[in-house]
């Protein structure tokens, strides 16, 4: 049994780190493999993660952790029974992928404006809470040529779009993702998308 692509891990800077890797051939990850992790810290214990399959030769493991601080460093050991396949280390604060924003809602009852709101995925006491900026993707299933990214660089998780900039009488979808500039993170996954119908019509004089 051989590791084809070494484990690569990212942390949500809250309570979970996700490690993914590829094996040299088809593997039943949960039956054949264990990923052991231990914080380099006085009197810490070794913890075990049971991986799941992620495609035929891919494995993924979700490591449960305490809150992340910048000093944290983990040793990682990938075992197949008594055989050590790979040994490495992981510093969560240097490999952060934020959680995806949630509760994306579209408010169309505001005159002339489409208001999008969503929730910050972190509690206020988390360091990432005040560091997230967002990208909102809006597209139309009726008009495949229309797709826009709106960068939200302020803290408030809202975006206002003049309804007049969207075509009337067709449906739109939106999704949002986040990243934290000062932590040099990757982008989060996209939130689930939400759909709305743009019924806005320009006043008669402007037609």
């Amino acid at each position: 049994m051989k590791v084809l692509q070494e484990p690569a891990c990212v942390s949500d800077y809250m309570s979970i780190s996700t490690c993914e890797w590829k094996m040299g051939g088809p593997t039943n990850c949960s039956a054949e493999l264990r990923l052991l992790y231990q914080l380099v810290f006085q009197s810490s214990e070794t913890h075990t993660c049971v991986p799941e399959n992620n495609g035929g030769v891919g494995c993924v493991c979700h490591l449960l952790m305490d809150d992340v601080v910048s000093m944290d460093n983990y040793t990682l050991d990938l075992w197949a029974g008594q055989q050590l396949l790979w040994k490495g280390s992981f510093k969560p604060s240097e490999h952060v992928k934020p959680r995806a924003p949630g509760n994306l809602t579209v408010h169309t009852n505001v005159s002339d404006t489409v208001l999008l709101t969503w929730s910050n995925p972190y509690p206020p006491d988390n360091y990432l809470y005040n560091d997230l900026t967002y990208a909102v993707n809006i597209w139309s299933e009726n008009d495949p040529a229309y797709s826009r990214i709106h960068n939200v660089t302020y803290l408030k998780p809202t975006l206002r779009i003049p309804a007049s900039t969207l075509k009337s009488g067709i449906s739109y979808r939106a999704r949002v993702r986040a990243w934290a500039q000062h932590y040099n993170t990757t982008w989060s996954e996209w939130s689930p998308s939400t759909k709305w119908y743009n019924s806005y019509r320009e006043p008669f004089e402007q037609r």
Partner: antibody, heavy 125, light 112 residues
Framework: EVQLVESGGGLEQPGGSLRLSCAGS????????MTWVRQAPGKGLEWVSS????????YYADSVKGRFTISRDNSKNTLYLQMNSLRAEDTAVYYC??????????????????WGQGTTVTVSS | DIVMTQSPLSLPVTPGEPASISCTAS???????????VDWYLQKSGQSPQLLIY???KRASGVPDRFSGSGSGTDFTLKISRVEAEDVGFYYC?????????FGQGTKLEIK
Amino acid sequence: EVQLVESGGGLEQPGGSLRLSCAGSGFTFRDFAMTWVRQAPGKGLEWVSSISGSGSSTYYADSVKGRFTISRDNSKNTLYLQMNSLRAEDTAVYYCAKDRLSVTVRPRYYGLDVWGQGTTVTVSS
Amino acid sequence: DIVMTQSPLSLPVTPGEPASISCTASQSLLYSIGYNYVDWYLQKSGQSPQLLIYLGSKRASGVPDRFSGSGSGTDFTLKISRVEAEDVGFYYCMQAYNSPYTFGQGTKLEIK
């Protein structure tokens, strides 16, 4: 009541051996790391050894490394210190102390918040 | 090894007066914000040490509020706002950042 009671001290000749025991009660013994600290007559406190809750990680002062072995039996709620190749400078009162909660991924530290009454080890010919 | 240097080594105090003991570590004991791995212990004559302060500033259960700990990184202080006769003994700082844990030399607090 959270309590630690040491035993096993005594008079031993240089080169001899002793095994100290520390019985814990009133807390979930296996969840906590444990530590031995000693105090030579008229001197300050000196850390000797520590062990994680499961016993998988052990730590020793350079002065005792290779001679002393820390261990625990969680089924008996008891901590041990096996002392071999004893020297005159090992003469001290030995205390066991409750250390950090080590079942969490990052052990939680509350100080050495419970200490035993101490057991005296005298190494002399 | 981390060296803990305590001062003063002897501290004569009048009852009701404040007292202060300093401890300097040879390297930072700050692991993350609010988590300085330094403790303060009091050992009264003929007794086992007892925990006063842990993580730099957190008062242990049952410790009177006249005891307080402060500092961060390498410099730490134990303050007693009003010394009482029962406070006499040896005070030790200890770093628990990593092994080997190391203690200061001890400060003997006595009543004038």
